[in-house]
Interface confidence: low
């Protein structure tokens, strides 16, 4: 009865040329114990012999003996349960279908997991938390579709090129759920790495490059402003003109309004970039900033002390 | 029914060669490792090597390489046994005996054996 | 080479009796696979050896329940629980985990 068969392993494993893979696999047979193995790359039942044709990687004696170029596929399970597999080095043209043939005393099964081989070594692909805000602690993921005990390798993370200082935590699974190496990255953006590429490189045991992903961080912050006065002491006489500008160096989204202050209470009607103030006089003497707000909330520039002499 | 039936064995002069046969019949033999184990009169078991007749891979015993060599006819399913420069301490039965064709590896059927007398 | 050494070399036992014999390797025979390949045979006088115990503990088909086999490592031991008339013969224990494969030196069961 076909249906006793159980088996678990991830669906779909994925390496490139020259690395291996390593196939986590557990199985039940109910009625006993496994009495033959046969792998097959894909295989195609032949309905005129009732048998599977297709190139046959291993076969159930002790020591895997296959024919003599596929020693580097090795049968890592037992008789009952364990049917994990292993090939090193994976070539290019073992893309396609596994076909695990179990025989025991009464039943036969064939289960099928499939393997994808690239050329090359395939890209890693970073996470992004939905939004990052300056100064606020984030997890940047890195994820690789890969891992095998026979070929180590190691995930970096760079801004700009540049190594980050930031310590990252590497996880692996090879689990019959999930095969994959993680790097996780806990990292607090400041505004001026908006825009900036980040950077997570796959490299081999040595250290060689393999293959990378890049994203553009986008740091939400508030607007980062500049105040200029004119004169740039901002010391006057009463009577005399002052004017103060407002540059804003960077905002993540867009500015929405803009507005002036004194002494922390905001000016009416003052909602452009330029302060004009004419024939100043002693009580408009005091501190003064610009604040210009975006969606993430108000930024404000360094204040301006204004000093309004007597004539 | 697996079978393994041994021939080839007799009297030889010591520096002289013999090639002992194993037919097999009752399963697939190129997908069986094939061994070679031999016993001195009132002495031991001694593995002498194997083949696998699906690709000709061999291994040895140390003492054996050189001398001895296993081969395999998976057209005839049977396996040889070609012992060259014999000596007076090759006489012994020599037995083929089949690998379980499981990674439970164990012998599960034996020939009956050939004997071999290297005398002058 | 991995030596195997049993003991003792002979032994006279009466029907019924419990009978261990002993089985040392020179250095661990576990396969690179986990898997310890540990056999014992038994043979009797003009006859071909024949398959008792595989992988340390399990019993090969066909063979009574009263013979068993354990151990780890480089200890091994086969066990006849209750002897009988036919289990007078020569009990070979055999390492397969590593090249080149070895015999012990073999254990006479004779009649008291």
């Known amino acids: 009865d076909s249906s006793k068969w159980v088996f678990e392993h991830p669906e779909t494993l994925y390496a490139w040329e020259g690395a291996c893979v390593w196939i986590p696999c557990t199985y039940r047979a109910l009625d006993g114990d496994l009495e033959s193995f046969i792998l097959f790359h894909n295989p195609e039942y032949n309905k005129n012999t009732s048998k599977f044709d297709g190139t046959r990687l291993y076969e159930s004696t002790k020591d895997g003996k296959v024919p003599s170029e596929q020693k580097r596929v090795q049968f890592l399970g037992d008789k009952n349960k364990n049917c994990t597999l292993s090939i090193h080095p994976v070539h290019l043209n073992d893309s396609g279908q596994l076909g695990l043939r179990m025989e025991s005393k009464t039943e036969k099964w064939m289960e099928r997991i499939h393997l994808n081989v690239s050329e090359r070594p395939f890209p890693p692909h970073i996470q992004l938390p939905p939004e990052i805000q300056e100064s606020q602690e984030v997890t940047l993921t890195c994820l690789l579709n890969f891992s095998c005990y026979g070929y180590p390798i190691q995930l970096q993370w760079l801004l700009e090129g540049v190594p980050m200082r930031q310590a990252a935590v590497t996880s692996t699974s090879l689990t019959i759920k999930s095969v994959f190496t993680r790097s996780e990255l806990k990292f607090s953006p400041q505004w001026s790495h908006h825009g900036k590429i980040v950077t997570c490189q796959l490299q081999d045991a040595d250290g060689k490059f393999l293959s990378n992903d890049t994203v553009q961080l986008n740091v939400k912050h508030t607007p980062k402003l500049e105040i200029k006065v004119t004169p740039s002491d901002a010391i006057v006489r009463e009577g005399d003109s002052v004017t103060m500008t407002c540059e804003v160096s960077s905002s993540n989204p867009e500015y929405t309004t803009v507005s002036w202050l004194k002494d922390g209470t905001s000016l009416k009607k003052q909602n452009t970039f330029t302060l004009n103030l004419r024939e100043v006089t002693k009580d408009q003497s005091g501190k003064y900033c610009c604040q210009v707000s975006n969606d993430v909330g108000p930024g404000r520039s360094e204040e301006v002390f204004l000093q309004v002499q007597y004539a | 029914e697996v079978q393994l039936v041994e021939s080839g064995g007799g009297l030889v002069q010591p520096g002289g060669s013999l090639r002992l046969s194993c037919a097999a019949s009752?399963?697939?033999?190129?997908?069986?490792?094939m061994n070679w184990v031999r016993q001195a009169p009132g002495k031991g078991l001694e593995w002498v090597g194997r083949i696998y007749p699906g690709d000709g891979d061999t291994n040895y015993s140390g003492k054996f390489k050189g001398r001895f060599t296993i081969s395999a006819d998976t057209s005839k399913n049977t396996a040889y046994l070609q012992m060259n420069s014999l000596r007076a301490e090759d006489t012994a039965v020599y037995y083929c005996a089949r690998d379980g064709s499981s990674w439970d590896w164990y012998f599960d059927v034996w020939g009956q054996g050939t004997l071999v007398t290297v005398s002058s | 080479d991995i030596q195997m050494t049993q003991s003792p070399s002979s032994l006279s036992a009466s029907v019924g009796d419990r009978v261990t014999i002993t089985c040392r390797s020179s250095q661990s025979i576990v396969h690179s696979n986990g898997n310890t390949f540990l056999e014992w045979y038994q043979q009797k006088p003009g006859k071909a050896p024949k398959l008792l115990i595989y992988?340390?503990?399990n019993r090969f088909s066909g063979v009574p329940s009263r013979f068993s086999g354990s151990g780890s490592g480089t200890d091994f031991t086969l066990t006849i629980s209750s002897l009988q008339p036919e289990d007078f013969a020569t009990y070979y224990c055999f390492q397969g985990s590593q090249f080149p494969y070895t015999f012990g030196q073999g254990t006479k069961v004779e009649i008291k």
């Open positions: 009752g399963y697939e033999f190129s997908r069986s490792w």
């Open positions: 992988k340390v503990s």
